[in-house]
């Protein structure tokens, strides 16, 4: 913490301006009134403060607003945002997308994924749901940030908003997030024709259950290998060789390269070798011909 001293009369601060860059840390602490700083936050970002000086200004604001900054201050944080921790941001209540845009711009090029994720979370909480305007802002100013939200937060996305989500916005989404988004996407695109539906639903398929994947295999979609590799292991394992062949179409030729990778590896282990041989790729590791498969999980469930 900055030690407290009294402010020399000639150093008294009546407005936030460039003269402050010549103040030492102790002088800033003693001479800048926190309320004045808060009222003139819009000037701070135009002044080339050092990181040490920004620490002092942050300390001032923290003392003035121990429960969290008001949005009028947050909106004008500028480079002071780089000094904020996720714990600081968790105290905020943010509803304005202009505030979100301003801070996303500042954070670009800095290692601030935890802070940005927390900020987005606060915006969703502040606005009550992940509405179309918020999604549009995220996709425009922070591609991939949608996936920083928890499954719980993503559950507030109305299906009508899903159309605004682009494939690249889902690149970093994990299985739990796609589990939440997939049913919404399915609902959002349900009235589309086969090929158009597949193009739209494809980025969300990491959350699809087996029955939906099986249904796709009957629709001549020719799923690419990259999409297939992102399907849930549990969704892929029950598929037959014939279903995978129909699902992938010409892309089935790519299974050879993915032979050792999940979910292909796990799927191969569950297929009869005879059936795998029909793919003409030399895939190995299937159940040898003549072997009987006992599903012990069924016996355990009965006993």
């Amino acid at each position: 913490d900055v030690e407290r001293t009294t402010c020399p009369p000639e150093k008294e601060v009546h407005e936030i301006d460039e003269s402050l860059i010549f103040y030492k840390k102790r002088e800033l602490e003693a001479c800048v009134d926190a309320a004045l700083l808060a009222a003139q936050m819009d000037r701070v970002d135009a002044i080339p403060f050092t990181y040490e000086q920004l620490d002092v200004l942050k300390h001032k604001l923290d003392e003035l607003y121990p429960q969290g900054y008001p949005e009028s201050v947050i909106r004008h944080l500028g480079h002071l945002f780089l000094k904020m921790s996720p714990e600081d941001i968790r105290k905020w209540n943010v509803t304005s997308l202009e505030t979100l845009k301003a801070l996303l711009k500042v954070s670009k090029g800095h290692e601030m994924s935890a802070q940005v994720a927390t900020l987005i979370d606060r915006v969703v909480v502040g606005r009550g749901q992940l509405d179309k305007d918020t999604v549009d802002t995220l996709t425009a100013f922070c591609p991939g940030c949608l996936c920083s939200l928890s499954p719980e937060r993503l559950s507030s996305v109305p299906p009508s908003v899903i159309g605004a989500v682009r494939p690249q916005d889902l690149d970093t989404c994990g299985p739990r997030q796609l589990d939440v988004l997939y049913p919404k996407a399915r609902l959002a695109f349900q009235n589309m024709s086969g090929s158009e539906y597949f193009v739209k639903i494809r980025p969300f398929l990491g959350g699809a259950p087996t029955e939906d994947v099986k249904a796709l295999s009957q629709q001549n979609v020719s799923m690419d290998l990259a999409t297939f590799m992102k399907l849930r292991r549990e969704a892929v394992l029950p598929l037959t060789v014939a279903e995978v062949q129909k699902l992938l179409g010409p892309h089935v030729e790519g299974l050879k390269v993915e032979e050792q990778h999940s979910p292909v590896r796990d799927w191969i282990l569950k297929q009869r070798q005879d059936d795998l041989d029909t793919l003409g790729l030399g895939l190995q590791g299937g159940i040898p011909n003549g072997y009987l498969i006992l599903d012990l999980s069924v016996r355990e469930a009965l006993s």
């Epitope: 690419d224 290998l225 062949q245 010409p250 892309h251 030729e253 790519g254 050879k256 390269v257 041989d277 029909t278 793919l279 003409g280 790729l281 030399g282």
Partner: antibody
């Protein structure tokens, strides 16, 4: 040693069909799909399609879909490519090519010697 | 389908010159590009796969680079036996496509 040996040159009239063969040896025939590529005189290479040698399932380039038929005879490790309704612009060298599945969908590491098909009235 | 635009369509260079051929894909193909050499009356011969991996027995004067949509094939010091037509092939999609070819001649 992997070898792809193709049938000999053919001269056909417009409207006729031609069937080119490609006999494979030196590897497990049913472990690699076979592709067909053609090259018109002085032109570049054009992928025509491929066939799964195990179940005979083909996939064709949209450009040839209505006229091409690819088949397989597992007993002789031979694949066939038949092109119908021939026209003069089908005059080309037709190659069979085997992919190596090193990455993605595989690049062609072995080629047949080529079969020249001439379409002329 | 993925289009492969190869340039130049032909070039003339002196023995010992550095020769560069480019291929541009119509969409991202990662590094899934191969380069072939074809001499008159012969089948294409694989030189490079996965953008820069040299096939065994191929002279080290041949090299490749790039990723995404822009790729380059280079002959560091042109030799008389390099007179041929060179093609790129994308295999990021099962429906393979070739570039239009570059005919390399000696000045």
């Amino acid at each position: 040693e992997v070898q792809l040996v193709q049938s000999g040159a053919e001269v056909k009239k417009p409207g006729a069909s031609v069937k080119v063969s490609c006999k494979a040896s030196g590897y497990t025939f049913t472990n690699y799909w076979m592709h067909w590529v053609r090259q018109a005189p002085g032109q570049g290479l054009e992928w025509m399609g491929n066939i799964n040698p195990s179940n005979g399932g083909p996939y064709y380039n949209e450009r040839f879909r209505s006229r091409v038929t690819m088949t397989v005879d597992k007993s002789t490790s031979t694949v066939y490519m038949e092109l119908s309704s021939l026209r003069s612009e089908d005059t080309a060298v037709y190659y069979c090519a085997r992919p190596y599945y090193g990455s993605s969908y595989g690049y062609f590491d072995y080629w047949g010697q080529g079969t020249t098909v001439t379409v002329s009235s | 389908d993925i289009q492969m635009t190869q340039s130049p369509s032909s070039l003339s260079a002196s023995v010992g010159d550095r020769v560069t051929i480019t291929c541009k894909a119509s969409q991202d193909i990662n590094k899934y590009i191969a380069w072939y050499q074809q001499k008159p009356g012969k089948a294409p011969k694989l030189l490079i796969h996965y953008t820069s991996e040299l096939q065994p027995g191929v002279p080290s004067r041949f090299s490749g680079s790039g990723s995404g949509t822009d790729f380059t094939f280079t002959i560091s010091s042109l030799q008389p036996e390099d007179i041929a037509t060179y093609y790129c092939l994308q295999y990021a999609n099962p429906l393979r496509t070739f570039g239009g070819g570059t005919k390399v001649e000696i000045k």
